[in-house]
């Protein structure tokens, strides 16, 4: 069944990074508009992006209510200009999205090195804690707040004068590494959720930061 001259949406795809979550679909509408519904397995259908001519819908405000829930969305197609018509007894065509569990599936955004500080032969590297749109008691939570110890960071570091990389890992946002005195080092970090077994277990690498630039501070003791 379907409504005259409307085409069901297809290629429904979740795009999610650090819990900012958008549902995308095709086709670009010609004489039709869309409405999205989202539900959890224990919840019910909630309509969003009413009668939109866009082919995306930001569902972040729904999924952040419980990022460990599994969500299902569907996109309804309506003929443009007739969306409020009650004359038709036909149900508008719709397509279901794949199921989406934010905690397991949101991509990890590119991390940023907040600072590094050298004290003698040790360097403390701090990763910036990203804020998310997930809330608890009206307070926005950081990525670390949400994932806790499930989230680790891998630090790649190397002497500016060579290409041999070393790695370190932490389940906080700080590294304390040993360096050679008098050498400049470069750093890059990557966010990782080791428990994930899918392609989204790692973020892209952060921008490289090197000693001798403004982010760092060096103190010889």
């Amino acid at each position: 069944s379907g409504t005259t001259n409307t085409v069901a949406a297809y290629n429904l795809t979740w795009k999610s990074t650090n819990f900012k979550t958008i549902l995308e679909w095709e086709p670009k509408p010609i004489n039709q508009v869309y409405t999205v519904q989202i539900s959890t397995k224990s919840g019910d259908w909630k309509s969003k992006c009413f009668y939109t001519a866009d082919t995306e819908c930001d569902l972040t405000d729904e999924i952040v209510k419980d990022v460990k829930q599994t969500y299902l969305a569907r996109v309804f197609s309506y003929p443009a200009g007739h969306v409020e018509s009650t004359g038709s007894t036909e149900e508008p065509p719709y397509e279901n999205s794949p199921e989406f569990t934010p905690y397991l599936e949101t991509n990890l955004g590119q991390p940023t090195i907040q600072s590094f500080e050298q004290v003698g032969t040790k360097v403390n590297v701090t990763v910036q804690d990203e804020w998310t749109l997930v809330r608890r008691n009206d307070t926005f939570l950081s990525l670390r707040d949400v994932f806790g110890k499930d989230l680790i960071y891998t630090l790649y570091y190397w002497k500016s004068s060579s290409s041999g990389k070393k790695t370190a890992k932490t389940n906080t946002n700080e590294f304390l590494i040993d360096v050679d005195k008098g050498e400049n080092y470069c750093f890059s970090v990557q966010a990782v959720i080791p428990s994930r077994r899918t392609a989204n277990r790692k973020s892209t690498d952060s921008p490289v930061e090197c000693m001798g630039h403004e982010k760092g501070e060096s103190r010889e003791i």
């Epitope: 069944s1 224990s42 919840g43 019910d44 259908w45 909630k46 036909e90 149900e91």
Partner: antibody, heavy 118, light 107 residues
């Protein structure tokens, strides 16, 4: 265990309003939607609408749009259904029922008989 | 709105009988079809959800299935406590709608 306890029977005159309460216990109130279903004497079941207690989002059957108002008080885990402009055909047992998935009513209140009579 | 047509509207059966009730939806509803039992003066009780899943605490003599657009509730061996009215209900599309009911009476 999940319990939904509704307020007592009501007798109303045509044109009046009625407000039925439904006190929930045994689960986290804001996690599950609350629906309202009515049943006229000797008749079938009719879905009226639903509310998400986490944000008070509502959805109503078109037949009741503008006449029914669903609300919640999360501090007391209580849901309310108010029906206005009552007419004799609104005489029915009104049930609150907790959702357990899209359009799935796993737990029901005991029902509240609303009689509309002049 | 989607309409469910239940058949039969009533039936007489004996204890131990196999009973089948059918519900046909006017439009596609995927597997979002639920069955409820109601006894006089009581609230409905969920028996089967998502076409064939047994709700917790419901005896295994109740089962649900689908063939094409026909959804079926089967009671394999009718017990005295099963004499009641049974409703199907679609949970796929708003507004949610119920069948008109099937009354199972003692023969």
């Amino acid at each position: 265990q999940v319990q939904l306890v509704q307020s007592g029977a009501e007798v109303k005159k045509p044109g009046a309003s009625v407000k039925v309460s439904c006190k929930a216990s045994g689960y986290t109130f804001t996690t599950y939607w609350m629906h309202w279903v009515r049943q006229a004497p000797g008749q079938g079941l009719e879905w009226m609408g639903m509310i998400d207690p986490s944000d008070s989002y509502t959805s109503y059957a078109q037949k009741f749009q503008g006449r029914v108002t669903l609300t919640v008080d999360t501090s007391t885990s209580t849901a309310y259904m108010e029906l206005s402009s009552l007419r004799s055909e609104d005489t029915a047992v009104y049930y609150c029922t907790r959702g357990s998935g899209p359009g799935l009513f796993a737990y029901w209140g005991q029902g509240t008989l609303v009689t509309v009579s002049s | 709105d989607i309409q469910e047509t239940q058949s039969p509207s009533s039936l007489s059966a004996s204890v131990g009988d196999r009973v089948t009730i059918t519900c046909r939806a006017s439009q596609g509803i995927s597997n979002y079809l639920n069955w409820y039992q109601q006894k006089p003066g009581k609230a409905p009780k969920l028996l089967i959800y998502h076409t064939s899943r047994l709700h917790s605490g419901v005896p295994s003599r109740f089962s649900g299935s689908v063939s094409g657009t026909d959804f079926t509730l089967t009671i394999s061996s009718l017990q005295p406590e099963d004499f009641a009215t049974y409703f199907c209900q679609q949970g796929n599309t708003l507004p949610y709608t119920f069948g008109q009911g099937t009354k199972v009476e003692i023969k």
